[in-house]
Interface confidence: medium
């Protein structure tokens, strides 16, 4: 589903983030404490170019609980 070269844009990006982040919610722009100064947000990282599941997960609102 998140193969190399795949881009996610618009509503499809939102839909995917909902699935990946589940009940945690997500941000389009990472909160400043976690932000990479060079990165504007997930649209630049996953729509303007391809991204992977690990990158998508960095936009979830709270860290995944470890088992």
């Amino acid at each position: 589903a998140y193969g190399p070269g795949e881009t996610l844009c618009g509503g499809e990006l939102v839909d995917t983030l909902q699935f990946v982040c589940s009940d945690r919610g997500f941000y389009f722009s990472r909160p400043s404490s976690r932000a990479n100064r060079r990165s504007r947000g997930i649209v630049e990282e996953c729509c303007f170019r391809s991204c992977d599941l690990a990158l998508l997960e960095t936009y979830c609102a709270t860290p995944a609980k470890s088992e």
Epitope: G10, G11, V14, G25, F28, A61
Partner: antibody, heavy 120, light 112 residues
Framework: QVQLVQSGAEVKKPGASVKVSCKAS????????INWVRQATGQGLEWMGW????????GYAQKFQGRVTMTRNTSISTAYMELSSLRSEDTAVYYC?????????????WGQGTTVTVSS | QSVLTQPPSVSAAPGQKVTISCSGS????????VSWYQQLPGTAPKLLIY???KRPSGIPDRFSGSKSGTSATLGITGLQTGDEADYYC????????????FGGGTKLTVLG
Amino acid sequence: QVQLVQSGAEVKKPGASVKVSCKASGYTFTSYDINWVRQATGQGLEWMGWMNPNSGNTGYAQKFQGRVTMTRNTSISTAYMELSSLRSEDTAVYYCARDPYYYYYGMDVWGQGTTVTVSS
Amino acid sequence: QSVLTQPPSVSAAPGQKVTISCSGSSSNIENNHVSWYQQLPGTAPKLLIYDNNKRPSGIPDRFSGSKSGTSATLGITGLQTGDEADYYCETWDTSLSAGRVFGGGTKLTVLG
């Protein structure tokens, strides 16, 4: 010029369904999501959902899930919004609006609106 | 009850400046991008501001947008009678049930 032209006014009975069309022209239909927004008389704007005309994928506001279906016919650059199990509270003006995939550009072109009246 | 809170109405005289506030939370305004729409009586909404503070071509620089934390503001300077309309803020809410959300709308009255 870039425009979205919607179908005409509809009068429906409670329990029925309505299907509103939105024909795009002046741009590449598959390059923009289509959103649907409604507005009851004297009330604010209420977002219903989005559709990607390229893939046909959709996302609906929780309030409308199970009652709304958004589809498209790319050969005629037209998007459709069907709302079922109509009730009087669904009486409103329904708008389609295009939305660049780069979501923060806003909904930059809107249809003229379609008035749907639900009355017994 | 809207997720984004706007004052129901504001008013000012022609030539004056007015601001319209839009208050939200971390799941919408703070971490997402805000748009503003103008809706003249009997017409469809029109995009005024996108990405917090950018104007589409054709929108005069009398209109401006800003964002700080969980609030956004629309500013209009040099008020004209033609500015009398309803104004709506909008963004994505990316909490559990993600979707676009609008403010309740603000009616701008240009006095006189």
